[in-house]
């Protein structure tokens, strides 16, 4: 139970992380301007990965696209390829443990394999969350850099009575998005590597304390009590030993190999 | 076609108190800024300030924060400007105008005159 | 505030000549998120309403008849009119729509001679 739990628990809140990554990739407030220093402002500009927009108080808005890739910063790109990777390796992540979900049967499944790809789809969820968690801090550090460049320069060029308030950019919503969204995708894979030691036969977990072996060789295995009895063919003192109480995660439908241990 | 009617001219002794309207009509209300401006007999164009008739919030600009204040009736689509205490310098022509693109102001009422004599 | 001043604040002509009037701001009217300025030309006849002509400094407004052109950038923009008809006479004000308050120009009165 706890490991179906544990299991669907961590692809939700990675589906959620993943859902979050996207919307931040997609979203046009990454850095928005700075009203600190100008409150009184009859227009508003905020930029994304892909556009940059304007928002009059009158109430239009007026997107532009990046329209050229050379021209663009060196770092920008580098966000947008971080978010892009982030996001397909949490799309295959998804695409993987929705066949690795423990409550979801294929054919006849062996457990390895949900084990083994509980395990890819969490260290995708892991790898795509920090790479929305690094695009976005790069993103940010390039802001604050900016920041206070544009804080040294704001009034250069004062000739005489005009000023030239220069924009500064501060953090959008979008970065407070991609942070939570890549940590939720983290911890989701974190939680599905988790759910796959769970998953593995050979670590499944009795809650019998004692085991009386009846006859021929008994090896004990460190991370439970399930006995090996060197035999292929005895299934039925498979799962003899649970104190009589059944969990979920103990009942099988088919048999796999691992029934014959 | 877009609208923005007036209330007639208003003649008051001063400390009265006015009240103009501002009625829209060919657009949403609700979408466009209303504004409203003074202009004084022989003197330039001076802003009042704006409504955002989505909030309902006003903004002000410093010389006419206190005796004037702006209200809406968003079901009826209007606009109105209150000026309290009536001064002598309050006689004027004041309009109200819809927000357009750019900021602009791209369309006005025909104008309400107040006059304040005793 | 920014203060927007106008020059001249009359201007006599003869019909058909070519007006032209500036209007500066103490700050820079230009928007760098889309490189536009937030400045607009009204011109307002006596008993009337003013009506929008340009804003974005250059964007003529539609109905505005094409020998209405705004130009300039930053600080320094100019409205002028080609070939002046009779019904243009008028009082033109320049407007900054860029930061609150949104202060007019004095206002430049154009004249018949």
């Known amino acids: 139970m706890a490991v179906t739990a544990c299991q669907g628990l961590g692809f939700v809140v990675s589906l959620i992380g993943i859902a979050g990554i996207i919307a931040a990739t997609c979203m046009d407030q990454w850095s928005t301007q700075d009203l600190y220093n100008n409150p009184v402002t009859a227009v508003f500009n905020y930029q994304g990965l892909w556009r940059s927009c304007v928002r009059e108080s009158s109430g239009f808005t007026e997107c532009r696209g990046y329209f050229t890739l050379l021209g663009l910063p060196a770092m920008l790109q580098a966000v947008r390829a971080l978010m892009i990777v982030g996001i397909v390796l949490g799309a295959i992540g998804l695409l993987v443990s929705i066949f690795a979900l423990k409550c979801i049967r294929i054919g006849s499944m062996e457990d390895s394999a949900k084990a083994n790809m509980t395990l890819t789809s969490g260290i995708m969820f892991i790898v795509s969350g920090l790479c929305a968690i690094a695009g976005v801090s790069v993103f940010a550090n390039m802001l604050v850099t900016n920041f206070w460049m544009s804080t040294a320069n704001m009034y250069t060029g004062m000739g005489g009575m005009v000023q030239t308030v220069q924009t500064r950019y501060t953090f959008g919503a979008a970065l407070f998005v991609g942070w939570v969204a890549g940590g939720l995708t983290l911890i989701g894979g974190v939680m599905m590597c988790i759910a796959c030691r769970g998953l593995a036969p050979e670590e499944t977990n009795y809650k019998a304390v004692s085991y009386h072996a009846s006859g021929h060789s008994v090896a004990y295995k460190p991370g439970g009590f399930k006995a090996s009895t060197g035999f292929g063919s005895n299934t039925k003192n498979k799962k003899i030993y649970d104190g009589g109480a059944r969990t979920e995660d103990e009942v099988q439908s088919y048999p796999s190999k691992h029934d014959y241990v | 076609q877009i609208q923005l009617v007036q209330s007639g001219p208003e003649l008051k002794r001063p400390g009265e108190t006015v009240r103009i309207s501002c009625k829209a009509s060919g657009f949403t209300f609700t979408t466009a800024g209303m504004h409203w401006v003074q202009k004084m007999a022989g003197k330039g164009l001076k802003w009042l300030g704006w409504?955002?008739?989505?909030?309902?919030?006003?903004k002000y600009a410093e010389d006419f924060k206190g005796r004037f204040a702006f209200s809406l009736d968003t079901s009826g689509s209007d606009a109105y400007l209150q000026i309290g205490n009536l001064k002598y310098e309050d006689a004027a022509t004041y309009f109200c105008?819809?927000?357009?693109?750019?900021?602009?102001?791209?369309?006005w009422g025909q104008g309400t005159s107040v006059t304040v004599s005793s | 505030d920014i203060v927007m001043t106008q020059s001249p604040s009359s201007l006599t002509v003869t019909a058909g000549e070519k007006v032209t009037m500036t209007c500066k701001s103490s700050?820079?009217?230009?928007?760098?998120?889309?490189?536009?300025?937030?400045l607009t030309w009204y011109q307002q006849k006596p008993g009337q309403p003013p009506k929008l002509l340009i804003y974005w400094a250059s964007t003529r407004e539609s109905g505005v008849p094409d020998r209405f052109t705004g130009s300039g950038s930053g600080t320094d923009f100019t409205l002028t009119i080609n070939t002046v008809q009779a019904e243009d006479l008028a009082v033109y004000y320049c407007?900054?729509?860029?930061?609150?308050?949104?202060?007019f120009g004095g206002g430049t009165k154009l004249e018949l001679r």
């Open positions: 409504t955002n008739t989505h909030s309902g919030e006003p």
């Open positions: 407007q900054n729509t860029y930061s609150y308050p949104l202060t």
């Open positions: 700050q820079s009217l230009l928007n760098s998120g889309n490189q536009k300025n937030y």
């Open positions: 105008a819809k927000w357009g693109r750019g900021n602009a102001l791209d369309y």
